[in-house]
Interface confidence: medium
C-alpha cells in the first residue's frame, strides 16, 4: 500500500536502532572515503527528519522518496568534488538517474588501508565507553570496504560483534576470548560479502530473470516439500529484496526481508519442517537463521523426473505455451531432488534442457530427439565432481597454504597479465575452499566448492572489469554467470604472454618481514611466487618448489640472525642469483 511518507513508514517498521544502522551503511557504501564523523552527522540529521515525519506525515519534504532525501544529503556535502571527483557530477541529475549514477561510482576496491583490529584491551575500553559509537565504526568500516554488502546481514554481524565483546570484555584474558570469536565473525562476513557481490552482479548483468532462476534452484533444494507455487512466491520475494539492496534501497530491503521471515514463519507447514528453531529468534537472527537453514528431508515418493519432462508426449506443447513456467518447473523438480548439486550446476542443466527443447521441438519427431536429454546431462555433472575430487585431494596433500600456492601458480599461468595483488587475493580466497568445503560430508562438497568458487571468481571479474588486462579473463567474465567457473577451470597457460623481465628488487627482502604477522608473511611469499611465475610462466613444479624452499630457508635464517639487516643485505643477492639459475 502507498504511504504518504515513505521515510516515516520505514522508520516505524524498522525502529530507530536499525533505521540508523541502515542509513549509516547506505551513506558509507555510497561515499566510501568520508570519515565516520561526517557520516554519523548526516545519519543523525536524517533520523531527526524521519522523526518529524513520524509525528506529522504532511510535514515539509516528508512526501519525498528516500532516494531523493538521501541524494540531497549526499550532494550537500562540502568539497564533494575535491574528494570524489566525477561522482559530484551525479548531483546535477534528477532521480532516478542520480541514484543510478551513485551506484555506478561504487568502488569494489577502494584505496583504503586494510581494516586493522585494535588490541584487545583498547577494543574493550572503547566498546565499554561507547558501544553505539564502537559498533557504528564497525558498520562504517565494513560498508565502505564492501559497497554491496547485504545491509540487513551486516546489522546481524554487528549484533554478533556486540555479543562477542559483551562476553569477552569481562574475561581476564580478553585477547584469548576475542581473537577466535572475532576471527570467526570476520571469516563469515567476508564470505557473505563475496556471495552478495555475486548476487548483485547477477542482477546488474543478467537481470531479475536470471536471479530468480538462481533463487528457485536454491529454495527448491532447501524446501523440497514445498510446492512449486510456494517456491515461486519465495523466489519472487527474495529477488525483490536483493534487487532493493543491490540498488541502494536499504531501508526497503531490510523491511521486506523482515516481512519475508514473518511470512515464512507463519507458513511453515507449506514450506519446511526445519523452520521452527529460527522462528523463535528476534528479527535479525531469525532472517539470518532462515537464510542458513538446513535442507528439509526430500519426500520419499518423488516420481522419476523423466515422467514429466521426457516421457510425457506433451513436453513440446507445455514448453511452447509457457516457456518460463515450464522451465521453472523443471528447475524446481530437478533441484529438489539434488541438494548434492551446486546451484550453478543445476542452472547449467536447466539451460541444457532448454537448448534441447528449442532444437527438438522444431524437428519432425521431438520425443525421439529429446528422449536422451537426461543422459546428456552426465558430462555436465561429472566435470564439477572431478574438479571437487582432484582439488580436495590436492588440499588434503598440501594443506591450506600449500594449496593456495598451487592455485596461485595455476591462475598466474592462466592470466599472467592480471596484477599480482589481485592474483594473490584471488588465489588465497580460492585456496580457502579446501578448509571450507573439503572437510564436509560427500553430499555437501560439490555445492559448497562450486558455489563458493563462483563467488570468488566473480570478485576477480569485478576487479578485472575496472582495469581489463587479460583477454582470457575478459572472455570468461563476459559469458554467462554459471559458465564462469568451468571457463576459468578450462583456461591453460597463456601462450601469448611475453614473460616479465627479472627485476632483482622484486625479490629483495628486508628485516621488516620478520616482525610481520603470519598472514602478512604468507602474502609476501605468495607475491614473490606470482612474480616468479610471471618471469617464468613455464617453470616446472619442481623448479618453483626449489626456489620457494630456498626463499623460505633464507627468510627463516635471516630472521634468526643476530644482525638481521646485514644477513638480508648479504644473503639476498645470493638468493636472487641462485633463483635465476634454478629457473634458467
Amino acid at each position: 500500500e502507498a504511504h504518504k511518507s515513505e521515510i516515516a513508514h520505514r522508520f516505524k517498521d524498522l525502529g530507530e536502532q536499525h533505521f540508523k544502522g541502515l542509513v549509516l551503511i547506505a551513506f558509507s557504501q555510497y561515499l566510501q572515503k568520508c570519515p565516520y564523523e561526517e557520516h554519523i552527522k548526516l545519519v543523525q540529521e536524517v533520523t531527526d527528519f524521519a522523526k518529524t515525519c513520524v509525528a506529522d506525515e504532511n510535514a515539509e519534504n516528508c512526501d519525498k522518496s528516500i532516494h531523493t532525501l538521501f541524494g540531497d544529503k549526499l550532494c550537500a556535502i562540502p568539497k564533494l568534488r575535491d574528494n570524489y571527483g566525477e561522482l559530484a557530477d551525479c548531483c546535477a541529475k534528477q532521480e532516478p538517474e542520480r541514484n543510478e549514477c551513485f551506484l555506478q561510482h561504487k568502488d569494489d576496491n577502494p584505496n583504503l588501508p586494510p581494516f586493522q583490529r585494535p588490541e584487545a584491551e583498547a577494543m574493550c575500553t572503547s566498546f565499554q565507553e561507547n558501544p553505539t559509537s564502537f559498533l557504528g565504526h564497525y558498520l562504517h568500516e565494513v560498508a565502505r570496504r564492501h559497497p554491496y554488502f547485504y545491509a540487513p546481514e551486516l546489522l546481524y554481524y554487528a549484533e554478533k560483534y556486540n555479543e562477542v565483546l559483551t562476553q569477552c570484555c569481562t574475561e581476564s584474558d580478553k585477547a584469548a576470548c576475542l581473537t577466535p570469536k572475532l576471527d570467526a565473525v570476520k571469516e563469515k562476513a567476508l564470505v557473505a560479502a563475496v556471495r552478495q557481490r555475486m548476487k548483485c552482479s547477477s542482477m546488474q548483468r543478467f537481470g531479475e530473470r536470471a536471479f530468480k532462476a538462481w533463487a528457485v534452484a536454491r529454495m527448491s533444494q532447501r524446501f523440497p516439500n514445498a510446492e512449486f507455487a510456494e517456491i515461486t512466491k519465495l523466489a519472487t520475494d527474495v529477488t525483490k529484496i536483493n534487487k532493493e539492496c543491490c540498488h541502494g534501497d536499504l531501508l526497503e530491503c531490510a523491511d521486506d526481508r523482515a516481512e519475508l521471515a514473518k511470512y515464512m514463519c507463519e507458513n511453515q507447514a507449506t514450506i519446511s519442517s526445519k523452520l521452527q528453531a529460527c522462528c523463535d529468534k528476534p528479527v535479525l537472527q531469525k532472517s539470518q537463521c532462515l537464510a542458513e537453514i538446513e535442507h528439509d528431508n526430500i519426500p520419499a515418493d518423488l516420481p522419476s523426473i523423466a515422467a514429466d519432462f521426457v516421457e510425457d508426449k506433451e513436453v513440446c506443447k507445455n514448453y511452447a505455451e509457457a516457456k518460463d513456467v515450464f522451465l521453472g518447473t523443471f528447475l524446481y523438480e530437478y533441484s529438489r531432488r539434488h541438494p548434492d548439486y551446486s546451484v550453478s550446476l543445476l542452472l547449467r542443466l536447466a539451460k541444457k534442457y532448454e537448448a534441447t527443447l528449442e532444437k527438438c521441438c522444431a524437428e519432425g519427431d521431438p520425443p525421439a530427439c529429446y528422449g536422451t536429454v537426461l543422459a546428456e546431462f552426465q558430462p555436465l555433472v561429472e566435470e564439477p565432481k572431478n574438479l571437487v575430487k582432484t582439488n580436495c585431494e590436492l588440499y588434503e596433500k598440501l594443506g591450506e597454504y600449500g594449496f593456495q600456492n598451487a592455485v596461485l601458480v595455476r591462475y598466474t599461468q592462466k592470466a599472467p597479465q592480471v596484477s599480482t595483488p589481485t592474483l594473490v587475493e584471488a588465489a588465497r580466497n580460492l585456496g580457502r575452499v579446501g578448509t571450507k568445503c573439503c572437510t564436509l560430508p560427500e553430499a555437501q562438497r560439490l555445492p559448497c566448492v562450486e558455489d563458493y568458487l563462483s563467488a570468488i571468481l566473480n570478485r576477480l571479474c569485478v576487479l578485472h572489469e575496472k582495469t581489463p588486462v587479460s583477454e582470457k579473463v575478459t572472455k570468461c567474465c563476459s559469458g554467462s554467470l554459471v559458465e564462469r567457473r568451468p571457463c576459468f577451470s578450462a583456461l591453460t597457460v597463456d601462450e601469448t604472454y611475453v614473460p616479465k623481465e627479472f627485476k632483482a628488487e622484486t625479490f629483495t627482502f628486508h628485516s621488516d618481514i620478520c616482525t610481520l604477522p603470519d598472514k602478512e608473511k604468507q602474502i609476501k611469499k605468495q607475491t614473490a611466487l606470482a612474480e616468479l611465475v610471471k618471469h617464468k610462466p613455464k617453470a616446472t613444479e619442481d623448479q618453483l618448489k626449489t626456489v620457494m624452499g630456498d626463499f623460505a630457508q633464507f627468510v627463516d635464517k635471516c630472521c634468526k640472525a643476530a644482525d638481521k639487516d646485514n644477513c638480508f643485505a648479504t644473503e639476498g643477492p645470493n638468493l636472487v642469483a641462485r633463483s635465476k639459475e634454478a629457473l634458467a
Epitope: 512449486f228 507455487a229 515422467a307 508426449k313 507445455n318 509457457a322 513456467v325 518447473t329
Partner: nanobody, 126 residues
Framework: EVQLLESGGGLVQPGGSLRLSCAAS????????VAWFRQAPGKEREFVAG????????YYADSVKGRFTISRDNSKNTLYLQMNSLRPEDTAVYYC???????????????????WGQGTLVTVSS
C-alpha cells in the same frame, strides 16, 4: 490435502450430452493441475482431459478431442467436463484427479496424481 468430489454422472443415450463436476476443497483449484480419467469395466484407467495449474492450458486424449471440453470455475473451486456426442465406448467410471502446485504439466500418467475423487458412473446406452 485436497478432497475431490465428482457429480453429474448418469445414463444417457448415444449422441447425448452430460456435464460432470468436481468440487475441490483444501486447495485452490486454479493452483493445481487437474485431470479427468476414466476406467471402463475390465480396462486400465485412462486419461481423458486435463488443465494446467495457474495457466489455462488444456490437454485431451485423441479419442475425445472435439467432443469433450474441460474447464474450471475458480470462484466455485470446481472443475467441469462437458461431454457431447457421447458414444457407447465412453461408458466408464469418471474420476477427477489433482496434482497440487503443478503449473502446466498435466501428465497423462495416472500414477503421478496423488489426489483422487471416488468417481461417478457414466453409462451411454440406448
Amino acid at each position: 490435502e485436497v478432497q475431490l468430489l465428482e457429480s453429474g454422472g448418469g445414463l444417457v443415450q448415444p449422441g447425448g450430452s452430460l456435464r460432470l463436476s468436481c468440487a475441490a476443497s483444501g486447495r485452490y483449484i486454479d493452483e493445481t493441475a487437474v485431470a479427468w480419467f476414466r476406467q471402463a469395466p475390465g480396462k486400465e484407467r485412462e486419461f481423458v482431459a486435463g488443465i494446467g495449474g495457474g495457466v489455462d492450458i488444456t490437454y485431451y486424449a485423441d479419442s475425445v478431442k472435439g467432443r469433450f471440453t474441460i474447464s474450471r470455475d475458480n470462484s466455485k473451486n470446481t472443475l467441469y467436463l462437458q461431454m457431447n456426442s457421447l458414444r457407447p465406448e465412453d461408458t466408464a467410471v469418471y474420476y477427477c484427479a489433482a496434482r497440487p502446485g503443478r503449473p502446466l504439466i498435466t501428465s497423462k500418467v495416472a500414477d503421478l496424481y496423488p489426489y483422487w475423487g471416488q468417481g461417478t458412473l457414466v453409462t451411454v446406452s440406448s
